[in-house]
Every structure is written in structure tokens, then in C-alpha cells.
């Protein structure tokens, strides 16, 4: 094949190889850019900033090499277009630093920085913990900073991400209240803070203020939603990204609901409950306190993380005539009381016998598996007869 | 499969504190599921001494019940038996099991 | 009264039909339930509930109830089937369990 005299060649079937040199000073419209995997960059002394829009359409990429040429600066976000990027070779460069934020969210197996002439800071904090780490082969690369001796080396008690402390109002907070939370950032070199508030939906009313180093939020006119959703103060420097999750509570009376009984392995009488705090429970049978014991007793369901109500059942273990009768879940915290009930009928009576009556044969549903905790039924295979002297 | 071991002292002076505890293994002790104590002395029937659920709801024998305390530690995924002012009519095999219908038990210790 | 009372002692010729039974007043409320415990074992859960038999319990074993008694009957009595046998229900308050004093079939 004839040697190719662009500035750019194919490699196989996806790659592309830049290596004449000084062709290149940016990456637009590179040809067949959205089908590469592969991208080969050598000897392009004028290629020197890396920027988002550089690698847009580049979304199949994998492996990025850009050696031997010119690069001095790598923006936060340039492989934002490039969420698949699994190898980056930056080697023999001029780059002083690279942002955290370059590689975040990226799944690199190797990242390759040797011979650039990197300034020890704590921006490289987080290069330094790669290499601790072991990740993307930092290690053996054995990174030197530029006239300060290996990156391993450089000090870093100081780099430390920022700190935040997020106030929460002491007082109980009602539904309709407004609430003031407040952000307090603390930390060398901040760059950026903010809310993340996409749990609240319509559980509050949201306004924004104040700025760097303290940051302000007014919850106005919540909802008893709002329990169990997280508000979330965050803030950026050049060592990394700091979160804090906060809830608040918001008080607001217990409510009971019952449903029918249904027959499952076992028995179970349906119940919701929901209020802040959460209301504490007892049951009633025909009126009088409800003892439970393993063959009667409330069975909660795996609470939802983000929300107050919680599900479950009064669980009766093959009850019988003595368990029919008025069902009443009491539901109580210190906002209110409330309180259902409901008839439940398991079975006649199974022990009365008059030989006068004719024989009820039934067949108890057969259990299939024990991970009700109940004991795995043996179905009878072999027919049987039922015959009855009357003396 | 739910396995249940029970492990403690074999000897207790009297006027002592018998405590035993039962290991769970092959299923969470959180699970719907209620546990138990049965004991039998030498040569005689058995006798249900107590019960407990995670939520630490329990149940006593009414005949010991003023001695007998029953734990839970979820944790450990282990329950234990606490049998206070022991006397000689307290010798026996103690059993732990799964309630109600104790369909899997521990192999049984002697105390 | 909060007993459970069986018979002391019960035997059967090989092949043929036995039935254990046991009384108590708490039996009008609720199930028994029954154990076989050989000797140095721990026991082993035969029925439960509305006649109901665990996985690897034998058809042979069965339960059936009326009034104050309820019953266990082996249906072709096996050599293994030797053993003690223990009724069980809760209690006539429904707060705590009791046993019967234990039947040896022979």
C-alpha cells in the first residue's frame, strides 16, 4: 500500500495514527471521529490545550496516546465526550498539572504521564494516591516533579479536600414550617459549591443564597415529604470533591390503615403506618391487648430508604376459630393517635365432630419452598379413604 | 439449610447462672422467625422454657418465668438463655430451636 | 388446665397401624404438633399445623384432630418408627406452649 500523506492515517479497522510532524494543533474534525477506538498522536509540537469540544464525536474512543508533542494544559472536562476511554498515554509532554477532574468518571486501566515536567502541588494529590493505590500503572512510572525529587515524595498534610458542616435546625420542624439550612465550607483553594437537591420534588419550596464560604438554603412551606430525602451540600478544590447529606425531619401525626386478611404460607392481616416519629404499635383482639408470640405477631416489610411509611402484617401461623374476630392497630406518637380495625374469619371451628355431620375433606395448600421460615410441606401422592364407625 | 448450635458451660453450682447461647447458621436470625429454648431433664419429657424475635418481643414459661431471661444478638446472628438460682432440678439437655413449630433444633447440651 | 396428656407407652406389630393420641383442653383451640426423638437425638418435627408434614417425613405419619384430642397415626408401622413421641400446642391462653408428657412406641 501506498504510504499515506495526510496528517492523519487509519490504523485497522477503528484506529487513527497523527505522527507528521507539527500537522496538528487541535483535533477538530478529525476524519471518521465517531466510529474510532483508537487514537495515536506523536510529534505535534503545536498541539498544546486539550478542551472539551477537541474530542466531541469521540464517543466509541478507548485508547488515547498523545506523546512527543506539545501539550501544556488538559481541561476538566475534555474526555466528557469520551466516557468509554479506558487507556491515556500523555507521556513527554509539557504538562505542569492535570486536574482531579479530568479522569473523573472515567474507568482508566492506565494512565501514562512519564516525562512531562509535572509541579509538585497539591493538585497531584490525587496522582499521588493512584500511585499509593497501585491504579492505572501510576506506580511504575515512578512520576518525578520537576526539580522536587519523586511525586511519592511530596507533602501533602495540607491537601486535604474541603471540610463542610451543614446546620440543621434543633427545633422540631411541622409541616408548613420554613427551614433554614446552612453550608459552611472550610478548606485551601475552593473552587466551587453548591446544593444538590434532586430528591425534594414538590416537598418544599427552594431558595438559594449567599455564596463561598457559607452557603444558604430556605425550605419553605415543607411537606411531610421531605422526611427521609437528602439535601446535599457539596464543594470542589483543586485536591477534590466534598459531600454532606443531611435529612430533615418533619413532624407530623401517626395514620394507620388495615386490609383484609389474606392466605399466603401463612395468615397475614395487611397494615401501613406512616408519621414522624416514627408512631409506636399495639394490637387488639376482640378489644383486649393483642400478646404476640410465634404463632401471632407484626412482621414489618424491608423499608423504602426515602420515604416515612412503613408496610407489614400481623402474621398468624395456621390460626384457627379462636383467632377469629376484630383486629385494631393502634398507632401513637406525640403528634396524634389514630387507629383501624378489621373482622378477620380464619376457620370454623376444626375440632367440633358430630358423626351426624357429613366429612369435610379438604387439602391444606402445599408449601413449595421454606423461605417463609415454615417447615417444607410433603404432599400426600397416594389417594386415602375416610371411614367412620358411629358406635 | 438452618443450623442451630448450642454451646455454654456444661456444669453450674447451684444457686448459679446457667447461660447458654445458640449460633444460627444458614439463615439470618432477622429473618421471620421466632426462636426458642426447650429443655429435658434425664430421663423425662420435654419442657418449652421461652421464645424470642428479633425485635426482641419474647415469651416465658409461666413456671420460670421470674428466672429465665432470653436474648438476642443480631449482630452475631446468635441467641442466648439466661436460667438464674439454678438447682439440681434444672439438670438437663437443653435444646435451642426455631419457633413455632420447631422444625430445626441444635443437637442439644448438657448442662 | 395447661397439660397435655399421652399415653406412657404404646407398641405395634410391624406393618400394622398405630395412633398416639393426646389431650388438653387447649387442644379445642388450637393444632398439636408432633416430635419423634430416638434415643441421644434431638427430636424431629412429624406434623404440624392442619396435618402437615415436613419434607422427608413419610406418608405413613398423619394427624387429625377432634374436640379434646388429637392424634398421630402410623399408617404401616416401620422398625425406625421406634421412638418417643411428643404432642405440642400453645397454650388454652395462647401465650406460652406446652407439652405432653411423651408416648414410647415400641
Known amino acids: 500500500a501506498a504510504p499515506c500523506p495526510d496528517a492523519c492515517c487509519p490504523h485497522g479497522s477503528s484506529g487513527l495514527r497523527c505522527t507528521r510532524d507539527g500537522a496538528l494543533d487541535s483535533l477538530h474534525h478529525l476524519p471518521g471521529a465517531e466510529n474510532l477506538t483508537e487514537l495515536y498522536i506523536e510529534n505535534q509540537q503545536h498541539l498544546q490545550h486539550l478542551e472539551l469540544r477537541d474530542l466531541r464525536g469521540l464517543g466509541e474512543l478507548r485508547n488515547l496516546t498523545i506523546v512527543k508533542s506539545g501539550l501544556r494544559f488538559v481541561a476538566p472536562d475534555a474526555f466528557h465526550f469520551t466516557p468509554r476511554l479506558s487507556r491515556l498515554n500523555l507521556s513527554f509532554n509539557a504538562l505542569e498539572s492535570l486536574s482531579w477532574k479530568t479522569v473523573q468518571g472515567l474507568s482508566l486501566q492506565e494512565l501514562v504521564l512519564s516525562g512531562n515536567p509535572l509541579h509538585c502541588s497539591c493538585a497531584l494529590r490525587w496522582l499521588q494516591r493512584w500511585e499509593e493505590e497501585g491504579l492505572g500503572g501510576v506506580p511504575e512510572q515512578k512520576l518525578q516533579c520537576h526539580g522536587q525529587g519523586p511525586l511519592a515524595h511530596m507533602p501533602n498534610a495540607s491537601c486535604g479536600v474541603p471540610t463542610l458542616k451543614v446546620q440543621v435546625p434543633n427545633a422540631s420542624v411541622d409541616v408548613g414550617d420554613d427551614v433554614l439550612l446552612r453550608c459552611q465550607v472550610e478548606g485551601r483553594g475552593l473552587e466551587q459549591a453548591g446544593w444538590i437537591l434532586t430528591e425534594l420534588e414538590q416537598s418544599a419550596t427552594v431558595m438559594k443564597s449567599g455564596g463561598l464560604p457559607s452557603l444558604g438554603l430556605t425550605l419553605a412551606n415543607v411537606t411531610s415529604d421531605l422526611n427521609r430525602k437528602n439535601v446535599t451540600c457539596w464543594a470542589e478544590n483543586d485536591v477534590g470533591r466534598a459531600e454532606v447529606s443531611v435529612q430533615v425531619n418533619v413532624s407530623f401525626p401517626a395514620s394507620v390503615q388495615l386490609h383484609t386478611a389474606v392466605e399466603m404460607h401463612h395468615w397475614c392481616i395487611p397494615f401501613s403506618v406512616d408519621g414522624q416519629p416514627a408512631p409506636s404499635l399495639r394490637w387488639l383482639f376482640n378489644g383486649s391487648v393483642l400478646n404476640e408470640t410465634s404463632f401471632i405477631f407484626t412482621e414489618f416489610l424491608e423499608p423504602a430508604a426515602n420515604e416515612t411509611v412503613r408496610h407489614g402484617c400481623l402474621r398468624l401461623n395456621q390460626p384457627t376459630h379462636v383467632n377469629n374476630g376484630n383486629y385494631t392497630l393502634l398507632a401513637a406518637n406525640p403528634f396524634g393517635q389514630a387507629s383501624a380495625s378489621i373482622m378477620a374469619a380464619f376457620m370454623d371451628n376444626p375440632f367440633e365432630f358430630n358423626p351426624e355431620d357429613p366429612i369435610p375433606v379438604s387439602f391444606s395448600p402445599v408449601d413449595t419452598n421454606s423461605t417463609s421460615g415454615d417447615p417444607v410441606e410433603k404432599k400426600d401422592e397416594t389417594p386415602f379413604g375416610v371411614s367412620v364407625a358411629v358406635g | 439449610e438452618v443450623q442451630l448450635q448450642e454451646s455454654g458451660p456444661g456444669l453450674v453450682k447451684p444457686s448459679g447462672t446457667l447461660s447458654l447461647t445458640c449460633a444460627v447458621s444458614?439463615?439470618?436470625?432477622?429473618?421471620?422467625?421466632?426462636w426458642t429454648w426447650v429443655r429435658q431433664p434425664p430421663g423425662k419429657g420435654l419442657e418449652w422454657i421461652g421464645e424470642?424475635?428479633?425485635?426482641?418481643?419474647?415469651n416465658y414459661n409461666p413456671s420460670l418465668k421470674s428466672r429465665v431471661t432470653i436474648s438476642v444478638d443480631k449482630s452475631k446472628n446468635q441467641f442466648s438463655l439466661k436460667l438464674s438460682s439454678v438447682t439440681a432440678a434444672d439438670t438437663a439437655v437443653y435444646y435451642c430451636?426455631?419457633?413455632?413449630?420447631?422444625?430445626?433444633w441444635g443437637q442439644g447440651t448438657l448442662v | 388446665s395447661s397439660e397435655l396428656t399421652q399415653d406412657p407407652a404404646v407398641s405395634v406389630a410391624l406393618g400394622q397401624t398405630v395412633r398416639i393420641t393426646c389431650q388438653g383442653d387447649?387442644?379445642?383451640?388450637?393444632?398439636a404438633s408432633w416430635y419423634q426423638q430416638k434415643p441421644g437425638q434431638a427430636p424431629v418435627l412429624v406434623i404440624y399445623?392442619?396435618?402437615k408434614r415436613p419434607s422427608g417425613i413419610p406418608d405413613r405419619f398423619s394427624g387429625s384432630s377432634s374436640g379434646n384430642t388429637a392424634s398421630l397415626t402410623i399408617t404401616g408401622a416401620q422398625a425406625e418408627d421406634e421412638a418417643d413421641y411428643y404432642c405440642?400446642?400453645?397454650?388454652?391462653?395462647?401465650?406460652?406452649?406446652?407439652f405432653g408428657g411423651g408416648t414410647k412406641l415400641t
Open positions: 430451636a426455631r419457633a413455632p413449630w420447631f422444625d430445626y
Open positions: 444458614g439463615g439470618s436470625i432477622s429473618s421471620s422467625n421466632w
Open positions: 424470642i424475635y428479633h425485635r426482641g418481643n419474647r
Open positions: 387447649a387442644l379445642r383451640s388450637y393444632y
Open positions: 399445623g392442619k396435618n
Open positions: 405440642a400446642s400453645q397454650a388454652s391462653s395462647g401465650n406460652h406452649l406446652i
